[in-house]
Amino acid sequence: QLSLPSILPNENEKVVQLNSSFSLRCFGESEVSWQYPMSEEESSDVEIRNEENNSGLFVTVLEVSSASAAHTGLYTCYYNHTQTEENELEGRHIYIYVPDPDVAFVPLGMTDYLVIVEDDDSAIIPCRTTDPETPVTLHNSEGVVPASYDSRQGFNGTFTVGPYICEATVKGKKFQTIPFNVYALKATSELDLEMEALKTVYKSGETIVVTCAVFNNEVVDLQWTYPGEVKGKGITMLEEIKVPSIKLVYTLTVPEATVKDSGDYECAARQATREVKEMKKVTISVHEKGFIEIKPTFSQLEAVNLHEVKHFVVEVRAYPPPRISWLKNNLTLIENLTEITTDVEKIQEIRYRSKLKLIRAKEEDSGHYTIVAQNEDAVKSYTFELLTQVPSSILDLVDDHHGSTGGQTVRCTAEGTPLPDIEWMICKDIKKCNNETSWTILANNVSNIITEIHSRDRSTVEGRVTFAKVEETIAVRCLAKNLLGAENRELKLVAPTLRSELTVA
């Protein structure tokens, strides 16, 4: 598709001095044409010519040798081969004003003074000033008519039938147009029907209210079809609104609703004068009492990595509207003390979405979180456990000598979530411990060596390895690992006879 042509001067509007000359240049990717305010007969002083340039663009110039009030209007540059009459002219526009102290209003053809309004639509009374600064008022037989004015178009408003005159004052001189006559074309062949139900969900005992409005039509027959119709349960009302336009508002009220009043509520409007029918329908549901349903989008055990940002979303269906709150470990969540926020948004009439947001997960964010939704008829909650996952780290690696027996115990304390696994490795040739191949995993079933693990709390574990007798210097490695990471530390175990050599790596 071609991009829109461009105009020089590159302005939305321009004021041109009376009797001066002006030119407008249009540049396009294909052949361009100009649409301008005057008719062919009036445009003897408008010259259109094509211009050559080396940009590869098509250039068409519009030149006016002596500007007059009649040149005031919209100038549109467009691709002439793409336009069809039913489409709005698609192009680039500039509006030219040519102020003339003796011509306050742009001259019009006689047909422009006939303003036809269809179905009490808004209309434009096209009195346009030659000077954008000229104040204009609109008058009819009753005086000044309030309507919005745009010097490019005229007065825009909803006008009753009859004659209207535009009045302007230029340098103390008063100007009036000849009367514009507004005529109305009434009655459409369509029915404009709108249905409104402020609520579609109710509970027993409440009053159902549904309205149907017919616009711009006074001769209408409207019928209601609804579940309680046979019992004559509904009360129907008609309100006629005449200002600013005709509107017939039909209201159906069903008091003391029961579950049996659930179903389709339909209004059908028929034009009395024509075989034209329009129908609108809404589905209403009535519940015995209020309800709440909670639907989480996550499980009852959730994990979050340290420093991660995570959202927990819960869908809630409820009527009447619920109050939604969040608890942590059965205490109300105090948001301003933590990097945790919650919010609730209404998605549809009875659907809500609540979010718990962890901004930067910390270890202390672990715990039991509960969402509670309640209204006057029901309370529902959902609890899930959150674990902040922390990489393994070794807190301590120490040895413990068993006196003269020569036995030694090494204790390795590690933390992390999930709880780390502890693995032991041994290097028997102390000179070669820098080489990874010298290390072997310590199996549980080796005689004279006992390994054991104790959980200290939810995130700390202690592993122990006991050597019945250490006869030569060896190195022991503790390896703590979980899903998020691993850490290891080593220490030397020195035979009791070589005690003075003991070091911790």
Epitope: Q1, T82, T84, E85, N87, E88
Partner: antibody, heavy 118, light 107 residues
Framework: QVQLVESGGGVVQPGRSLRLSCAAS????????MHWVRQAPGKGLEWVAV????????YYADSVKGRFTISRDNSKNTLYLQMNSLRAEDTAVYYC???????????WGQGTLVTVSS | DIQMTQSPSSVSASVGDRVTITCRAS??????LAWYQQKAGKAPKLLIY???SLQSGVPSRFSGSGSGTDFTLTISSLQPEDFATYYC?????????FGQGTKVEIK
């Protein structure tokens, strides 16, 4: 992207009325003239009606003149076809269409089937 | 009203064939002519407008020519997806008459 979605089709008895709607999105609806085109089962395309971008003009095919009314609501981006005094020969898939390519129809709806039968 | 007449009403061809469809207007319409492709159960798709301008996204094997009263749609090398019905339409003034259609079938 440009989308036209027709609705309102169905089975109707001869002599009765039906109103078709065409919901537009993805383009400046109020700048385009809009058309209805129909296609009887196993037959070719037949142009039905046009309405100007600003509702200032309407034209109809001779076969529907006086019975069908085309209208539009630019505030709702919707085109309508009110079909009165329906006949068996009005049975067809009805498409709404429009476009900028020198009068050709760049975009079309998926169509809605109207069956006139007793 | 201006009548649009297409010929042939159907054509049998093989993949790779060159296919030509003609459309004649009962009065001159300059280059105000469009060509559409329609597959069973689908809406028509614009191929050519202004008699010879290729619509964006349409393969270059489709081309249009002509002016005044006689117009031609050519498919230079028929592909499996080209088996469909083709319509011409006048695009100036009203009614916007269509031709009766040409069905391109597998030989």
């Amino acid at each position: 992207q440009v989308q036209l979605v027709e609705s309102g089709g169905g089975v109707v008895q001869p002599g009765r009325s039906l109103r078709l709607s065409c919901a537009a999105s993805g383009f400046t609806f109020s700048s385009y003239g809009m058309h209805w085109v129909r296609q009887a089962p196993g037959k070719g395309l037949e142009w039905v009606a046009v309405i100007w971008y600003d509702r200032s003009n309407k034209y109809y095919a001779d076969s529907v003149k006086g019975r069908f009314t085309i209208s539009r609501d630019n505030s709702k981006n919707t085109l309508y076809l009110q079909m009165n005094s329906l006949r068996a020969e009005d049975t067809a898939v009805y498409y709404c269409a429009g476009g900028r390519s020198r009068g050709a129809f760049d975009f079309w709806g998926q169509g809605t089937l109207v069956t006139v039968s007793s | 009203d201006i009548q649009m007449t297409q010929s042939p009403s159907s054509v049998s061809a093989s993949v790779g064939d060159r296919v030509t469809i003609t459309c004649r207007a009962s009065q001159g319409i300059s280059s105000w002519l469009a060509w559409y492709q329609q597959k069973a159960g689908k809406a028509p798709k614009l191929l050519i407008y202004s008699a010879s301008s290729l619509q964006s996204g349409v393969p270059s094997r489709f081309s249009g020519s002509g002016s005044g009263t006689d117009f031609t749609l050519t498919i230079s090398s028929l592909q499996p997806e080209d088996f469909a019905t083709y319509y011409c339409q006048r695009t100036n003034s009203f009614p916007r008459t269509f031709g009766q259609g040409t069905k391109v079938e597998i030989k």
